[in-house]
Interface confidence: low
């Protein structure tokens, strides 16, 4: 009831707790002398469902039949209305609508660890919306029984607080759960099990790893387990991987040798335990052990390339470049690279250790046959050396790849294509595509990039260290034994018209013509590969269209003659530069008057 109900009563039939879909009868009646003063016939009783009127009646009592109540709680209040006064609350009642409990399903019991206690879980089924009591019963050998009750509205778990022991591991125990509420009761199917069925071992602990003689091939994992554990499963993976390697072991007694670990790799290890081959359940996974495997000597060979530069009649500069080994090939921290330079006929050799760089430059005589060997070393040893005979990579004209082209391919990619050399194409052992940023001065400090391509390929996509709006000098080498041929081309991944034109720095007169000299456009303003320069000129103070001369772009060129100027006429000259995307704005203007005689 809601309050003391001094003025009257509300009665509910058949019960305050009803089954979903049932009808309930609600009666509100006034106590003697509690109606409206003087006018008992004017008594007006009103029944509210929450705040909404659902019925009224003049007199001392009111009967109402209510159907269709929802699951849960509904509040009814009876009030008295008299003339010229506010409604007075008489009494009220709550109706609880629910359902009988469904049969609990999937009753399952577990004991965590050999020293743990038996606890059971089940599925309650649909919510009864009513106070429901669950009783869990366990019966064992020798008529032993245990019982535990749970009065939580959402009860689906109970712990008996008893410990099953392994003295008779095959003895049967039976559990059953019964749910009871005001509308009925229901029991689960019995669940019968033995000690071995329900004991779930604690996860292994104190996990350690040992590498005999600091070798990854002699690795043992150690751990501790509860006494009755028969089976273990191990899982391990590199820390940066999602995929686990799994191993099942029997009677491991807390140790197992792992044979397939990779060197110099951080691994995560976990172990789980079980008491019986086909009974019971696996423990939770142990806490992770993280450990790094030892280094092994590098495997694989360095990808080495080189560049030759003429210094003078007797000397040449050799620049060696190599790529880092992959993590799986390095198998440790590379401490240094060993470079050996040898003159093959005289046998002279020089060895140097390089740290912190993947390139090396030296000067050698132009005479003799030279070879280099480069290897990578970690704490355990060195990779097999990559040996290269130093040759003139472009000497064999017949080996030069033909029709080399370079085209933008998507963003920051250049697709290089070529045709095999005229000489027997089957002689080609491999192609090397080399690229570097184009610098007018031919700066040897500019990083060199390369990739190797199989002899049957006639294209390569270059994407490493490619920037937009930068021109690259691209060379394709065809290598065959100790011979090489090459072809080169300029290419860019993305281009715009240059941001500025060349700056004319001098105009000189030579035998009736003029020589124009200019400064190169800064690389960052070229916006791609330059195709042409244009020189424009017109008579000063003239409105006529300027004349122009278009010069194909060559890296080293920075002057050009013009011989079509009239003597003793003052001209204004300027220059522009063009990429495939368009023409730059013009550079500075210079005036010049040819002094010589007319032709």
């Amino acid at each position: 009831k809601i309050d003391a109900c001094k003025r009257g009563d509300v009665t509910v039939k058949p019960s305050h707790v009803i089954l979903l879909g049932s009808t309930v009868n609600i009666t509100c009646s006034l106590k003697p002398r509690q109606g409206c003063f003087h006018y008992s016939r004017r008594n007006k009783l009103i029944l509210y469902k929450f705040d909404r009127r659902i019925n009224f009646h003049h007199g001392h009592s009111l009967n109402s039949q209510v159907t269709g109540l929802p699951l849960g709680t509904t509040l009814f209040v009876c009030k008295l209305a008299c003339i010229n006064s506010d409604e007075i609350q008489i009494c009220g009642a709550e109706i609880f609508v629910g359902v009988a409990p469904e049969q609990p399903q999937n009753l399952s019991c577990i004991q965590k660890g050999e020293q743990g206690t038996v606890a059971c879980t089940w599925e309650r089924g649909r919510d009864t919306h009513l106070y429901t009591e669950y009783t869990l019963q366990l019966s064992g050998p020798k008529n032993l029984t245990w019982q535990k009750q749970c009065k939580d509205i959402y009860c689906d778990y109970l712990d008996f607080g008893i410990n099953l022991t392994p003295e008779s591991p095959e003895s049967n125990f039976t559990a059953k759960v019964t749910a009871v509420n005001s509308l009925g009761s229901s029991s689960s199917l019995p669940s019968t099990f033995t000690f071995l069925d329900i004991v779930r071992p604690l996860p292994p602990w104190d996990i350690r790893i040992k590498f005999q003689k600091a070798s990854v091939s002699r690795c043992t994992l150690y751990w501790r387990d509860e006494g009755l554990v028969l089976l273990n499963r191990l899982r391990y993976r590199p820390s940066n991987s999602r995929l686990w390697n799994m191993v099942n072991v029997t009677k491991a007694k807390g140790r197992h040798d792992l044979l397939d670990l990779k060197p110099f790799t951080e691994y995560e290890f976990q172990i789980s335990s079980k008491l019986h081959l086909y009974k019971g359940s696996w423990s939770d996974w142990s806490e992770s052990l993280r450990a790094q495997t030892p280094e092994e000597e590098p495997t694989g060979m360095l990808d080495v390339w080189y560049m030759k530069r003429h210094i003078d009649y007797s000397r040449q500069q050799i620049s060696l470049f190599w790529k880092n080994l992959s993590v799986s090939e390095a198998r440790g921290k590379i401490l240094h690279y060993q470079v050996t330079l040898q003159e093959l006929t005289g046998g002279k050799a020089m060895t140097q250790n390089i740290t912190g760089h993947t390139s090396w430059t030296t000067v050698i005589p132009r005479t003799g046959n030279w070879a280099v060997a480069v290897s990578a070393a970690n704490s355990k040893g060195s990779s097999l050396p990559t040996r290269i005979n130093i040759m003139n990579l472009c000497e064999a004209g017949l080996l030069a790849p033909r029709q080399v082209s370079a085209n933008s391919e998507g963003m920051d990619n250049i697709l290089v294509t070529w045709q095999p050399p005229r000489k027997d194409p089957s002689a080609v052992q491999e192609y090397v595509v080399e690229w570097r940023e184009l610098h007018p001065g031919g700066d040897t400090q500019v990083p060199l990039n390369w990739l190797r391509s199989r002899p049957y390929n006639v294209s390569a996509l270059i994407s490493e260290n490619i920037k937009s709006y930068i021109c690259y000098e691209i060379r394709v080498y065809a290598l065959s034994g100790d011979q090489g041929g090459c072809s080169s081309i300029l290419g860019n991944s993305k281009h715009k018209a240059p941001l500025s034109g060349p700056h004319i720095n001098a105009i000189t007169e030579e035998k009736g013509s003029i020589l124009i000299s200019w400064n190169s456009i800064p690389v960052q303003e070229q916006m791609g590969c330059l195709l042409h320069y244009r020189i424009y000129w017109k008579e000063r103070d003239s409105n006529s269209q300027p004349q122009l001369c278009e010069i194909p772009y060559r890296v080293s060129q920075n002057s050009h003659p013009i011989n079509s100027l009239q003597p003793r006429v003052t001209y204004v000259l300027w220059m522009t530069a063009l990429t495939a995307a368009g023409e730059s704005s013009h550079g500075n203007e210079r005036e010049f008057c040819l002094q010589g005689k007319a032709n």
């Epitope: 992959s326 993590v327 998507g410 963003m411 920051d412 990619n413 697709l415 290089v416 990739l451 190797r452 391509s453 199989r454 390929n457 294209s459 390569a460 996509l461 994407s463 490493e464 260290n465 490619i466 920037k467 937009s468």
Partner: nanobody, 120 residues
Framework: QVQLQESGGGLVQPGGSLRLSCAAS????????MGWYRQVPGKQRELVAE???????TYVDSVEGRFTISRDNAKNTVYLQMNSLKPEDTAVYYC??????????????WGQGTQVTVSS
């Protein structure tokens, strides 16, 4: 095969910002290009921004100056910072990773996509 997992999409008002993330796993050593594409219903998927292993970036003209692509090599993750968002940026944004080897596209892997809605 490279697995790509995008996150960070959502509803934002015009002028607002979002940061999309794309985590790569699997054969990540082979990736040359990572980028973001977008698609509106009934239209072709279009490139928004792309970043090469060399670290250079490219943007479609309509997002230049507003969107920034970046990456965290240690986490194998590429990001797209989207500022000054406009209603026409509404689309499903897809992460893409391309692996080129010796001039051939050996892998072209896509994420599941994340919805970006710009609306007041």
């Amino acid at each position: 095969q490279v697995q790509l997992q995008e996150s960070g999409g959502g509803l934002v008002q015009p002028g607002g910002s979002l940061r999309l993330s794309c985590a790569a796993s699997g054969s990540i050593l082979r990736i040359n290009l990572m980028g973001w594409y977008r698609q509106v219903p009934g239209k072709q998927r279009e490139l928004v921004a792309e970043m090469s292993t060399g670290g250079s970036t490219t943007y479609v003209d309509s997002v230049e100056g507003r969107f920034t692509i970046s990456r965290d090599n240690a986490k194998n993750t590429v990001y797209l910072q989207m500022n000054s968002l406009k209603p026409e940026d509404t689309a499903v944004y897809y992460c893409n990773a391309k692996a080129w080897q010796l001039g051939r596209l050996e892998n072209d892997d896509w994420g599941q996509g994340t919805q970006v809605t710009v609306s007041s």
